[in-house]
């Protein structure tokens, strides 16, 4: 976003009237916090916690598996990804608390909140990764039961850190501390100062990579997938499936106002009055897409109580059943019944 | 209207110290920073710190390493700058110079004279 | 530190013709609030600095209406639409978005 997206409180006798009130004194801290930001930090606090918790949690139920189920894999790299991302939250929290001020230097400033962008590419290259997964086992289930191992889901999460990366480079390089000479304060953000131009294009690809390339494949993966297992009872793996197009809805559902808000700022000047109120909301438009640090977790838990029924089971077991289910194609004209139970035990050691 | 005026002219050995003050009149002393800037001969403007006289609050610009100390006396409305360790690249015109935070303007608008200062052996 | 550059560094001048003096930041000057602390002061032979302009475009008081800024980000231009014996002296533009505190170079206006 431009020049520095994060504003400053409000001076009531501070640049608004040509007048002087020379008996005024001068509050160079202001106590109140505007209500974008309030929102921000509870949002913050909510998802520090259940991200923290519910991630660590997911974690440590998918790393059992993850040797041999290759779901578990495709789980286990996203709750990393947004546990890393909650990690920053106490630091941002600060942050907003003291109006914005950045009193953690340089190097935080150019690591902490690239975080939460290094979950963004991340998340959606493995979403990609796992809808691809998804694709295989309905349309090339032969192609699966020969080639579908947990080496080849390692290689694609690598792959997908990797150029999550790459990806998160450019936002990394032009983040930079700026000391305001009054009010006095630190800031952290993105400066671009003389190069419009590639400040757009950062915003862009962030806009077209990050979201708009991901939701068209993936919806379009997902409309085929969802036919095939509809029309023809296609997979046993519904329920990892109704899994997926939950986490991949959420993740559009957050991110949006961010990206919108970023192409939108990228586009204005910083001092006209659109620029300034999409300044406001930035904490909020961030916080709001934090929120796929911590929903994936509670999709889970949902999810698992909704196939348990009423079956009453602990967290861990809930969270196993739902995560390290393996997905087993059953194609009717293909195969017999023995063949589809000899291929789910073979599966079952993947 | 405001005034600042400014002590008179010094002539300092290299290593010693200059302290330089600043009166001011005609507004609200309390409510502004007093900035210092100096200016070398036939050289620009050159921004040295700030102090803020109602809590003491200063700023330095980081180029003078500790060196130079900022200090206001708000039942006199004066300011202080004081250099130590002169060099002769110090030699000088030093200004105090008002930043007032109440109005609109949120500039540096009014200066004092300026202070000589000679740094020789 | 924000680098202050302006240009021309000598300007000489007709009486009554236009002046313009330009000045570029290494950093953008847009304040988080959304103003531009970008200042210009005039030094007359022998004097203290005087404010100009503040803000980019505001005219401090007192000073003649022939005074003009203008620009945005980094760029920024003091215009004399009428050149006065007066005018002479070094113009300096300032910003006071950033510490510390930086001002350009100077451009000395003489007459022609």
């Known amino acids: 976003m431009n020049s520095f997206n994060y504003t400053t409180p409000d001076y009531g006798h501070y640049d608004d009237k040509d007048t002087l009130d020379l008996n005024t004194p001068v509050d160079k801290t202001s106590n109140t916090l505007r209500v974008p930001d309030i929102l921000a930090l509870v949002i913050f606090a909510v998802v520090f916690l259940v991200g923290v918790l519910g991630n660590a949690l997911v974690v440590w139920v998918t790393a059992f598996e993850a040797k041999r189920t290759i779901n578990a894999i495709w789980f286990l790299n996203l709750a990393v990804a947004d546990f890393l991302s909650c990690l920053a939250l106490p630091i941002l929290f600060t942050s907003i608390v003291q109006h914005h001020h950045w009193p953690f230097g340089g190097a935080a400033c150019s690591i902490l909140p690239s975080l939460i962008l290094l979950n963004m590419y991340a998340s959606i290259l493995l979403l990609a990764t796992i809808s691809a997964d998804r694709f295989l086992l309905v349309f090339k289930p032969i192609w699966c039961q020969n080639f579908r191992g947990a080496g080849l889901a390692w290689i694609a999460c690598a792959v997908a850190w990797g150029l999550a990366l790459l990806l998160t480079i450019p936002s990394f390089l032009y983040r930079v501390v700026r000391e305001e000479y009054f009010p006095p304060k630190v800031l952290c953000g993105v400066d671009y100062s003389h190069d419009k131009r590639r400040e757009r294009a950062v915003a862009i690809v962030r806009l077209v990579l990050g979201f708009l390339w991901p939701l068209l494949t993936l919806t379009i993966c997902y409309t085929f997938i969802l036919l095939r297992t509809w029309s023809r009872r296609a997979t046993r793996s519904t329920k990892t499936l109704k899994v997926v197009v939950a986490v991949v809805a959420s993740f559009f559902i957050f991110w949006l106002p961010y990206q919108v808000t970023g192409i939108m700022m990228s586009f204005l000047e910083p001092s006209s009055p659109t620029f300034l109120l999409l300044n406001k909301l930035d904490s909020l438009c961030v916080s709001f897409a934090y929120i796929n640090c911590c929903i994936n977790p509670i999709i889970y838990v949902v999810a698992g109580q909704g196939f348990q029924g009423r079956l009453r089971k602990s967290l861990p077991s809930l969270l196993r059943n739902v995560l390290t289910e393996e997905s087993v194609v059953r194609e009717s004209k293909s195969f017999t019944r023995s063949t589809v139970d000899t291929m789910a035990q073979k599966t079952q050691a993947v | 209207q405001v005034q600042l005026v400014q002590s008179g002219a010094e002539v300092k050995k290299p290593g010693a110290s200059v302290k330089i003050s600043c009166k001011a009149s005609?507004?609200?002393?309390?409510?502004?920073?007093m900035n210092w800037v100096r200016q070398a001969p036939g050289k620009g403007l050159e921004w040295m710190g700030r102090?803020?006289?109602?809590?003491?609050?200063?700023k330095y610009n980081g180029k003078f390493k500790g060196r130079v100390t900022i200090t206001a006396d708000e039942s006199t409305s004066t300011a202080y700058m004081e250099l130590s360790s002169l060099r002769s690249e110090d030699s000088a015109v030093y200004f105090c110079?008002?930043?007032?935070?109440?109005?609109?303007?949120?500039?540096?608008?009014?200066w004092g004279q300026g202070t000589t200062v000679t740094v020789s052996s | 530190d924000v680098v202050m550059t302006q240009s021309p560094l000598s300007l000489p001048v007709t009486l009554g013709q236009p002046a313009s003096i330009s000045c570029r930041s290494s950093?953008?000057?847009?304040?988080?609030?959304?103003?531009?602390?970008l200042h210009w002061f005039q030094q007359r032979p022998g004097q203290s600095p005087r404010l100009l302009i503040y803000?980019?475009?505001n005219r401090f008081s007192g000073v003649p209406d022939r005074f003009s800024g203008s620009g945005s980000g980094t760029d920024f231009t003091l215009k004399i639409s009428r050149v006065e014996a007066e005018d002479v002296g070094v113009y300096y533009c300032?910003?006071?978005?950033?510490?510390?505190?930086?001002f350009g170079g100077g451009t000395k206006l003489e007459i022609k």
């Open positions: 110079a008002r930043f007032l935070l109440i109005s609109t303007v949120t500039a540096v608008d009014y």
């Open positions: 005609g507004y609200a002393f309390s409510n502004s920073w």
């Open positions: 102090i803020y006289p109602g809590d003491g609050d200063t």
């Open positions: 950093q953008s000057l847009v304040h988080s609030n959304g103003n531009t602390y």
């Open positions: 803000k980019v475009s």
């Open positions: 300032s910003q006071s978005t950033l510490v510390p505190l930086t």
